[in-house]
């Protein structure tokens, strides 16, 4: 019977995606989460709305990706940040932005950053601004790994399901 | 016999690449286009040309990549832009560049954005500027499914197989 | 018989690409290389150290990773750079920063990019700067192929292993 | 079943040269590298490098830069190693070799003994 | 050039034995590492690779492991046709080379 055998996830994916009556051998875990658009000052990663998605063992852990089993995996994320031009009266401060992708591991106390893109932004007069930033990348992991980012600028984030993602899937 | 109930275009890479005496249930399709340098103020992209491919499937029709079968891909694009100094006599006025991946789907009567990325130049005097984008992500997607770019810049584009392309591949 | 069922381009794949004929079926080739943060003026790449790793084949030369069986493979490299502001007494000149991943095969006396990524900076007074490169795509590649880097700005590079590095993966 | 045939060694004059040759079938020749690999007598074993029948790609251990060619005939599926200037100490059994993933020595030839003396 | 030390450089066992047999990069090589065997007068035969994989139609008593500078090759059970040289050999860069051999011989 279709999704037999298979993970709760799994057996969805193969109702929903007939193509794969999949043995467990060729399960593949895969995971695309976008930033809640609702929450302003924050980035929350969501996947249950739009494009995203959990498969095949993936869940979401304290807004981090938990690792299903052990493997390579190609992990990425994307942010796009946008500003308005600063009033004549302020004086213009430089803005840091950054974004990066982090492991917390057993192995380790702290967090590792495995992925990590950064940029100084000097509003200007009558000048709006926009950046994207993305990063992706194969890593080793292990079963149980949990995949976060931290993001400088959050308030200037575009929040919407196709500028600011976070992902991974297995090799 | 070799080639027998395939594509054409499949039969030619298995000759190129005999690599791959795969049985179906490992057919991998992938596709990897250049935007067309002859086409100065157009993005036209192209499969049959240096280093791009159409593989196990995959196929252009209307400027856009058509899914093979259902499941999941990793979709990616990256554009090049470039500009010289404004002139003194010129106003210099702001230039947004923007590159999008967007999903048309018999399921939605609007092209979705997948992937956007969006900055805006300043041009200065003597200033020649250079800007790169790049995205990539996981989608579920249905047999079917088109797979398309939307660019705000083009005149800017900076057309070569190495800087200007869209690809996808199926986990 | 090889190909059979295949479509027409899968069956030139299959004879073109023979594939793993192995216990090898289940080989990932993978890689993902670092910058070495104690080469502060070039850029030497690292398999053997944090995160980075060769899997299943892949093996360096001359700081050129070599394609350990023929196929199709996702390649990537990110670099970010950073600089100070210039002196009041110095004049700006402006930076020109690249990055590029290329192919060094002797089908070809050359070496052809596959992946570029450029900008210029304008370093100002008071004003350090940042700025990330990110690209990856697919592309068919041959067993003893060399892919290699080429990065105009080196001495700016922020070395760190979440911030330069190249790799590559089999589809 | 995949076979390497070499030939060519023998008896070579320091400071002569010499051209071997490895016949290889029951693969598709053009889908992997050719090897060569030699082995002093009583000794270890070397890699010289390698050449891609494909697209005549190659790779040289840095010590036979200079010295050592090898190359490939797609028609005739055989691969050669052309070594100059031999000496005394170029005095080995040579081995083609046919990797799977590239680095891995998967299938070896009955190997081919080239003595440098005069 | 990465050096690869392999000790012992010969030793002897009995049928029957566990045997190991070790190897020491110069660096660091990730898991880069492969193991053959060779017999007087023949070509060597590929054992393991990846320093754990076994190859195609190697039988179960081998068995490879180590990463990073030491890597060991373990024959559980020592059969008769098991008697030869044994070469480590890493693949993390170019030029491969290969460790000195280690020859087990019948006590």
């Known amino acids: 019977l279709p999704g037999v055998g298979l993970t709760p996830s799994a057996a969805q994916t193969a109702r929903q995606h007939p193509k794969m009556h999949l043995a467990h051998s060729t399960l593949k875990p895969a995971a695309h989460l976008i930033g809640d658009p609702s929450k302003q000052n924050s980035l929350l990663w969501r996947a249950n709305t739009d494009r995203a998605f959990l498969q095949d063992g993936f869940s979401l852990s304290n807004n981090s990706l938990l690792v299903p089993t052990s493997g390579i995996y190609f992990v990425y994320s994307q942010v796009v940040f946008s500003g308005k031009a600063y009033s004549p009266k302020a004086t213009s401060s430089p803005l840091y932005l950054a974004h990066e992708v982090q492991l917390f591991s057993s192995q380790y106390p702290f967090h590792v950053p495995l992925l990590s893109s950064q940029k100084m932004v000097y509003p200007g007069l009558q000048e709006p601004w926009l950046h994207s930033m993305y990063h992706g990348a194969a890593f080793q992991l292990t079963q149980g790994d949990q995949l976060s980012t931290h993001t400088d600028g959050i308030p200037h984030l575009v929040l919407s399901p196709s500028t600011v993602f976070f992902g991974a899937f297995a090799l | 016999l070799p080639g027998v109930g395939l594509t054409p275009s499949a039969a030619q890479t298995a000759r190129q690449h005999p690599k791959m005496h795969l049985a179906h249930s490992t057919l991998k399709p992938a596709a990897h286009l250049i935007g067309d340098p002859s086409k100065q103020n157009s993005l036209l992209w192209r499969a049959n040309t240096d280093r791009a491919f159409l593989q196990d499937g995959f196929s252009l029709s209307n400027n856009s990549l058509l899914v093979p079968t259902s499941g999941i891909y990793f979709v990616y694009s990256q554009v090049v832009f470039s500009g010289k100094a404004y002139s003194p006599k010129a106003t210099s006025s702001p230039l947004y560049l923007a590159h999008e991946v967007q999903l048309f789907s018999s399921q939605y009567p609007f092209h979705v954005p997948l992937l956007s990325s969006q900055k805006m130049v300043y041009p200065g005097l003597q200033e020649p500027w250079l800007h790169s984008m790049y995205h990539g992500a996981a989608f579920q997607l249905t047999q079917g499914d088109q797979l398309s770019t939307h660019t705000d810049g083009i005149p800017h584009l900076v057309l070569s197989p190495s800087t200007v392309f869209f690809g996808a591949f199926a986990l | 018989l090889p190909g059979v069922g295949l479509t027409p381009s899968a069956a030139q794949t299959a004879r073109q690409h023979p594939k793993m004929h192995l216990a090898h079926s289940t080989l990932k080739p993978a890689a993902h290389l670092i910058g070495d943060p104690s080469k502060q003026n070039s850029l030497l790449w690292r398999a053997n150290t944090d995160r980075a790793f060769l899997q299943d084949g892949f093996s360096l030369s001359n700081n050129s990773l070599l394609v350990p069986t023929s196929g199709i493979y996702f390649v990537y490299s990110q670099v970010v750079f950073s600089g100070k502001a210039y002196s009041p007494k110095a004049t700006s000149s402006p930076l020109y920063l690249a990055h590029e991943v290329q192919l060094f095969s002797s089908q070809y006396p050359f070496h052809v990019p596959l992946l570029s990524s450029q900008k210029m900076v304008y370093p100002g007074l008071q004003e350090p700067w940042l700025h990330s490169m990110y690209h990856g795509a697919a592309f068919q590649l041959t067993q003893g192929d060399q892919l290699s880097t080429h990065t105009d700005g080196i001495p700016h590079l922020v070395l760190s292993p979440s911030t330069v590095f190249f790799g590559a993966f089999a589809l | 079943e995949v076979q390497l045939v070499e030939s060519g060694g023998g008896l070579v004059q320091p400071g002569g040269s010499l051209r071997l040759s490895c016949a290889a079938s029951?693969?598709?020749?053009?889908?992997?590298?050719i090897h060569w690999v030699r082995q002093a007598p009583g000794k270890g074993l070397e890699w010289v490098g390698y050449?891609?029948?494909?697209?005549?790609?190659?790779n040289y251990n840095e010590k036979f830069k200079g010295r050592a060619t090898i190359s490939s005939d797609k028609s005739k599926n055989t691969a050669y190693l052309q070594m100059n200037s031999l000496r005394a100490e170029d005095t080995a059994v040579y081995y083609c070799?046919?990797?799977?993933?590239?680095?891995?020595?998967?299938?070896w030839g009955q190997g081919t003994l080239v003595t440098v003396s005069s | 050039d990465i050096q690869m030390t392999q000790s012992p450089s010969s030793l002897s066992a009995s049928v029957g034995d566990r045997v190991t047999i070790t190897c020491r990069a110069s660096?660091?090589?990730?898991?880069?590492v492969a193991w053959y065997q060779q017999k007087p007068g023949k070509a060597p035969k590929l054992q393991i690779y990846?320093?754990?994989h076994r190859y195609t139609g190697v039988p179960s008593r081998f068995s490879g492991s180590g990463s990073g500078t030491d890597f060991t090759l373990t024959i559980s059970s020592l059969q008769p046709e098991d008697f030869a040289t044994y070469y480590c050999?890493?693949?993390?860069?170019?030029?491969?080379?290969f460790g000195q051999g280690t020859k087990v011989e019948i006590k």
């Open positions: 990846s320093a754990s």
């Open positions: 050449n891609n029948p494909y697209n005549d790609g190659t």
């Open positions: 050999q890493e693949s993390y860069s170019t030029p491969w080379t």
């Open positions: 029951g693969y598709t020749f053009t889908s992997y590298v």
């Open positions: 070799s046919r990797p799977t993933m590239l680095p891995w020595f998967a299938y």
């Open positions: 660096q660091a090589v990730s898991s880069a």
